[in-house]
Interface confidence: low
Amino acid sequence: QSPPGKPEIHKCRSPDKETFTCWWNPGSDGGLPTNYSLTYSKEGEKNTYECPDYKTSGPNSCFFSKQYTSIWKIYIITVNATNEMGSSTSDPLYVDVTYIVEPEPPRNLTLEVKQLKDKKTYLWVKWLPPTITDVKTGWFTMEYEIRLKSEEADEWEIHFTGHQTQFKVFDLYPGQKYLVQTRCKPDHGYWSRWGQEKSIEIPNDFTLKD
């Protein structure tokens, strides 16, 4: 039996700059029941606060609701582990909510096969920003990637589309089925997970419709 090992703050992420969650990895518990508490202060303030919500985001986490989230302050966060034999504190993590945004994936992905006058076909991929992001007001500037592969291919081909919410993919094989996904990243933030997969078959005998 021994004091607990040093916990480590694994990451902090915000879906929308309005709330955020921090997760930690507990160290060894020293073979004893161990309590974990997350405390934080804000840069330039003397007060230290305890995590407002240990439940919402699951085990070893702290959820900061709107009420506790401010984007103009840097949070200094530590996790403390305590058992009968002693205690141990993580290294502090400095968090600027603006820089930890990991949004939901883009939505409404649509795929359409088009044909140019020279008979070259292309796939027109379109999507919308994630619901929660207020892109119109400039509160968020979102960048996008799409990835696609033929159904049987080993590798994905990734295209960065910048701020565009549409992309034309040339060089696709007729008769092949292609899978497409999108993801997004705000300025200074993290890529979302890849969104729902959509598929489309490139026709063998595509004829131009009037």
Epitope: S150, E152, A153, K168, F170, D171, L172, Y173
Partner: antibody, heavy 118, light 112 residues
Framework: EVQLVQSGAEVKKPGSSVKVSCKAS????????IHWVRQAPGQGLEWIGE????????NYNQKFKGRATLTVDKSSSTAYMELSSLRSEDTAVYYC???????????WGQGTLVTVSS | DVVMTQTPLSLSVTPGQPASISCRSS???????????LHWYLQKPGQSPQLLIY???NRFSGVPDRFSGSGSGTDFTLKISRVEAEDVGVYFC?????????FGGGTKVEIK
Amino acid sequence: EVQLVQSGAEVKKPGSSVKVSCKASGYTFTSYWIHWVRQAPGQGLEWIGEIDPSDSYTNYNQKFKGRATLTVDKSSSTAYMELSSLRSEDTAVYYCGRSFFTNWFAYWGQGTLVTVSS
Amino acid sequence: DVVMTQTPLSLSVTPGQPASISCRSSQSLVHSNGNTYLHWYLQKPGQSPQLLIYKVSNRFSGVPDRFSGSGSGTDFTLKISRVEAEDVGVYFCSQSTHVPFTFGGGTKVEIK
């Protein structure tokens, strides 16, 4: 796993022909173009041509048109490159390559050395 | 035919140092569909070439992120941010915008 396995080394006389094979596995053979590229000793790479295994449609480098013939056997998932009227400057390692989405070569055979010597 | 000119011909690099290879094409590699089909291959000693970068800047699967490609039109660059011993070999640029597809003459990279 995508694999392209080529036939063994050949020694040929000037004026004769050589036929190199490239057996594909690990994917649907008819779905991707096969390209042929050669590399003379200590030299760079030279594209010979490409073939669509689904319908045997070919594109050739003009330099090899009339001398190179690209064919496929769909039943055995094998592509062939035949080069006729061989001369000493045709001595090279010949590679087959498979496209990824279109025309860059993500997968290559191990190469076949063809030596043309009298 | 489109002529691809690579410089330098050879490069001797200390491990951990950066390296840069230039590739210039005799005409624009922008296809009528807007894509630029400029690719980079590495041929390690005694091996077949392997794809590193396709369409100017897209790293092929499994290629370490120390490799990056950039450029547009007729001027392109392959950069290795920190050269490792396993990076030795001959680097080729290649264009597949125009038929016939053509390759650069190659740049031999060795370790000091």
